[in-house]
């Protein structure tokens, strides 16, 4: 399927130009999306181009500025949050990034009713997390690892926890590993629906080994960054969940929620918390060996002021073929009866589908089915369930939004997005207002992204929120590469691939091939999305063919493919990239002597192993911030797929799957190894060990480090990185500069 039509008129082609590296580094062809900040069923907030915060009412068609850009500018605010009673806005400034999601900031409260900032009992700085209650204008915030509560912004704070300590005890915020690998949030506290209770997690990292690395900065002596970071097999954080009554916080204080007995019997994780009502909460727990998950529904006991989690309200989810869930264990979406819920998990055929659980998981009613996967449940209302899947036309890399009518019997299914802008839009997400009265659809491609507003009852499009007209105009004179998404059938395995072809692609000619790989468990690279990025430039200007292949271990094509890599990372992911390359060579337009592979993070691991596979297929390759041994990576992630690095578990494969073990095999390839020295995620240690092994084996290679840069290699490092990699590839492919 050719997703980007080539332009055929010669007169047009003369005025058109190829993409430049500068275009990419400057973000010239970046797109915009529009996600309404919903504040009711029919109202949303949006920050206008001139930085005013504007409230839009869909039904009246009216809009007005609720917060002036003058106010935003007076505190250099980069973000805002309106209290549910609409009386206050918090303004966030002095943003200081910590890890992937976490950051600290200074918060100011603006009183909308009085038209001024709140003075008195001001918030301390910097704050680690702050949020409004779901009703009214209570504030919960985390400062120096402790949680505080304010009944009103101008009131003195009530301190909920007192044991918070840097790198030791975390209250209301996750430690490093929970943030990155379990919660995927900067917070670990949750208001009940009407703000009566506040639940929070306490993480005790006292016994966790610490990763230490130098941060060079500008001082005479570098400083040392210390992070409690459990690597595979190491001591893990100890988690406890507490709930406090925010109306009378001093009355009984925080009450601990009991852990299910079958979970508490060995090392375990807390995976998520979902409030059902003000007096019912659902907690999800996971054994350290991550194939057993327990969903526990707990009720408030007024008489004892405690939380009761009866065994009859424990639901077990177990995988016999891999780990529990996909990347994470899915979260429940409760229905209006406040006890039954909808949840995505594997059906008997090994495809992730929506199930309705009323009493037990064994009696779950399957809502969706087929050789495709349900991906996300967006919203459940009294009569409809909205979800996304990759069912349409059997393309796993698409996302369409569906509505199932659950109010009628039998339930009927309707694809909301499949035929809206079929050529332009095949990959959607959605954002719903209260009660799904209205929703926004955000289409990511394959054409230029577009965001639209829709009526939640009729699905009628109301208006276009963002259509990227400037981008469309800017691209009119650009020779974009052609993209196609197809599949290879090899030994009963389907390998979907995306091929990016030079604008004047001619099948009778030979082109250099670059494989871009990620390949991590439950990832997906072959997606029908729009992008003008580095590989677009390599195809457009440098005449390369770029291919992305989803092999075994990747997501949304069933458990057989997903769990194939269970307990043996680094084998099939690499094999499948190699198999695909061989198939591409058979297509006749690839120059066999000019094939390269590159990847970042997990992709750096796969590209390194592919280069060291001894096949002779690859002339050169690049690994950016690669994992080199699973013993060096985080426990939560690694053990999910690999088990423990112990003799009686999976130590042997931990040892066999390192990049260092294959150092000798790099002798006949050109290898560029790149890493940031301040990578908190995939530690520089990984590349240091690869480099040491290559030196010890007397194998020549190229390397680049980025001082004080983390896993993202951002800012000026990005420009340097892509320029450097471009030179490396052009040299490898004998392309003139």
């Amino acid at each position: 399927i050719v997703l980007r039509p080539s332009r055929v008129h010669n007169s047009e082609e003369n005025t058109m130009r190829a993409l430049t590296l500068k275009d990419i580094l400057n973000g010239t062809f970046s797109y915009k999306t529009f996600f309404p900040n919903w504040i009711s069923g029919q109202e949303y907030l949006h920050q206008s181009a001139d930085n005013n915060i504007v409230l839009y009412n869909i039904e009246t068609g009216q809009s007005y500025t609720i917060l002036s850009n003058r106010t935003m500018k007076s505190v250099n605010a980069s973000n805002y949050g309106l209290s549910p009673d609409r009386q206050f806005v918090y303004l966030e400034s002095d943003y200081s990034k910590l890890w992937r999601y976490s950051y600290t900031a200074t918060y100011y409260i603006y009183d909308l009713s009085n038209g001024e900032f709140v003075r008195g009992n001001e918030l301390p700085r910097p704050i680690q997390y702050l949020c409004w209650s779901p009703v009214g204008s209570k504030l919960a915030y985390v400062y120096q690892n402790n949680i505080y509560l304010k009944q009103r912004p101008g009131d003195p704070p009530f301190q909920i926890t007192f044991n918070g300590r840097e790198n030791k005890i975390f209250n209301g915020i996750p430690d490093w590993v929970y943030e990155e690998e379990m919660l995927a949030t900067k917070y670990a506290l949750w208001w009940s629906p009407n703000g009566k209770f506040l639940a929070y997690a306490e993480f005790n990292d006292t016994d966790i080994p610490v990763i230490a690395y130098s941060y060079y900065g500008d001082e005479q002596y570098p400083r040392t960054i210390n992070i409690p970071y459990p690597k595979a097999g190491a001591k893990n954080p100890v988690v406890r969940i507490f709930i406090i009554d925010t109306t009378y916080p001093a009355y009984v204080g925080p009450q601990e929620v009991p852990v299910p007995a079958m979970i508490a019997s060995s090392d375990y994780y807390f995976s998520w918390l979902t409030w059902v009502t003000d007096e019912r909460v659902c907690l999800q727990w996971l054994k350290r060996v991550q194939n057993v998950s327990v969903l526990s529904i707990c009720d408030f006991r007024e008489d004892w002021q405690t939380w009761d989690c009866p065994k009859t309200q424990e639901h077990i989810e177990e995988s016999r073929t891999g780990w529990a869930g996909g990347f994470f264990v899915s979260t429940p979406v409760f229905s209006y009866d406040a006890i039954s819920y909808y949840k995505i998990f594997s059906d008997k055929d090994g495809y992730k589908h929506i199930h309705y659980i009323k009493d037990t998981v064994e009696n779950a009613i399957q809502i969706t089915s087929g050789k495709w996967e349900a991906i996300n449940i967006f919203r459940v209302t009294q009569d409809s369930l909205f979800y996304s899947s990759n069912e349409f036309e059997e393309y796993p890399g698409r996302r369409n939004i569906y509505r199932i009518s659950i109010g009628s019997y039998p339930p009927s299914k309707k694809c909301v997005t499949c035929h809206l802008r079929k050529e332009r839009c095949q990959y959607y997400t959605a954002s719903f207002s209260d009660y799904a009265k209205y929703y926004a659809l955000v289409c990511y491609g394959p054409g230029i992204p577009i965001s639209t507003l829709h009526d939640g009852r009729t699905d009628q499009e109301i208006k276009i929120l963002e259509e990227n007209k400037e981008l469309e105009n800017a691209l009119k004179n650009i020779q974009l590469p052609k993209e196609e998404i197809k599949k290879l059938e090899v030994d009963e395995i389907t390998l979907w691939y995306k091929m990016i072809l030079p604008p004047q692609f001619d099948r009778s000619k030979k082109y250099p091939l670059l494989i871009q790989v990620y390949g991590g468990p439950c990832s997906q690279s072959v997606r029908s999305v729009f992008a003008v990025n580095w590989i677009s430039y390599l195809a457009s200007k440098e005449g390369m063919v770029i291919a992305l292949v989803d092999g075994r271990g990747t997501a949304f094509q069933g458990d057989k493919l997903l769990y194939a890599v269970y307990r043996k990372l680094g084998v099939y992911e690499v094999e499948d990239q190699i198999t695909a390359v061989r198939k591409f060579i058979e297509m006749g337009f690839i120059d066999e002597k000019r094939i390269a592979i590159w990847g970042w993070s997990y992709g750096g691991y796969v590209s390194s192993l592919a280069l060291a596979s001894g096949t002779g297929l690859f002339k050169c390759g690049i690994a950016v911030a690669p994992v080199s041994s699973w013993e060096y990576y985080a426990s939560v992630y690694t053990e999910r797929f690999m088990g423990l690095p112990t003799k009686d578990d999976n130590l042997e494969h931990y040892k066999n799957s390192t990049v260092m073990a294959r150092a000798e095999y790099f002798r006949n390839v050109d290898y560029l190894l790149i890493h940031g020295t301040a990578d908190d995620n995939v530690h520089f240690q990984n590349s240091a060990q690869i480099a040491k092994a290559l030196v010890n084996a007397q194998v020549d290679f190229q390397a680049m480090w980025y001082s004080d840069q983390n896993h993202g290699l951002s800012g000026l490092s990005t420009n340097h990185l892509y320029t450097h990699m471009t030179h490396f590839l052009k040299q490898c492919f004998s392309l003139s500069d």
Epitope: L55, Y64, T65, I66, S68, R70, T71, S74, V75, R86, Q87, Y108, D111, L112, S113, N114, G115, E116, F117, V118, R119, G120, G154
Partner: antibody, heavy 124, light 113 residues
Framework: QVQLVQSGAEVKKPGASVKVSCKTS????????IHWVRQAPGQRLEWIGG????????NYNQKFKGRVTITVDTSASTAYMELSSLRSEDTAVYYC?????????????????WGQGTLVTVSS | DIVMTQSPDSLAVSLGERATINCKSS????????????LAWYQQKPGQPPKLLIF???TRESGVPDRFSGSGFGTDFTLTISSLQAEDVAVYYC?????????FGQGTKVEIK
């Protein structure tokens, strides 16, 4: 000259409601919040509440919460204060006053112009 | 709530003499980040609404005679009429606008001795 003109005196029975208006002119209505202050005979001035005309969001003194409703009609540049469940101790002169909106963090303003006052008498 | 207490309750001063009114707040009205005190002084004559004289504790409202001055910071404030005139006979109120609810002092009645 800035003007805040209030509605006339009212006599009400206990348990009834009263609605006082405050018509403003000769300034940009949306640049100022409107506040209501009362003064019972021989008593100090007492703040009842205020409203921001830009968004219609009121803020009430907890003492009056549940009994007072402050609204605005931006098109008429007029603010209203309604007090319900009147009792004899609500007998007072009720004033509206304007207060400049503080857009900036380093701002904060006093009430610079006041209405002439409306006498509300609560008597059976 | 911030409680405002004025002293004296009433004051009789000869024409041309200095009149001094004190106002004490139950908590500081000094906004440290701005170094501004959120205190205002009003003058109210019989049958009239209050009139703003001073804001930010010491800044005179435009059109207010310079015989009126305000001073103080934190919790203790003073309004001074340097040379009392006949038209200055009125009740004077201090008011804090540091936080809500806005509160006023009980008032000081200034008369001519």
């Amino acid at each position: 000259q800035v003007q805040l003109v209030q509605s006339g005196a009212e006599v009400k029975k206990p348990g009834a409601s009263v609605k006082v208006s405050c018509k403003t002119s000769r300034y940009t209505f949306t640049e100022y919040t409107i506040h209501w202050v009362r003064q019972a005979p021989g008593q100090r001035l007492e703040w009842i509440g205020g409203i921001n005309p830009n968004n219609g969001i009121p803020n009430y003194n907890q003492k009056f919460k549940g009994r007072v409703t402050i609204t605005v009609d931006t098109s008429a540049s007029t603010a209203y204060m309604e007090l319900s469940s009147l009792r004899s101790e609500d007998t007072a002169v009720y004033y509206c006053a304007r207060r400049r909106i503080a857009y900036g963090y380093d701002e904060g303003h006093a009430m610079d112009y006041w209405g002439q006052g409306t006498l509300v008498t609560v008597s059976s | 709530d911030i409680v405002m207490t004025q002293s004296p309750d009433s004051l009789a001063v000869s024409l041309g003499e200095r009149a001094t009114i004190n106002c004490k707040s139950s908590q500081s009205l000094l906004y440290s980040r701005q170094q501004k005190n959120y205190l205002a002084w009003y003058q109210q004559k019989p049958g009239q609404p209050p009139k703003l004289l001073i804001f930010w504790a010491s800044t005179r409202e435009s059109g207010v005679p310079d015989r009126f001055s305000g001073s103080g910071f934190g919790t203790d404030f003073t309004l001074t009429i340097s040379s009392l005139q006949a038209e200055d006979v009125a009740v004077y109120y201090c008011q804090q606008y540091f936080s809500y609810p806005l509160t006023f002092g009980q008032g000081t009645k200034v008369e001519i001795k």
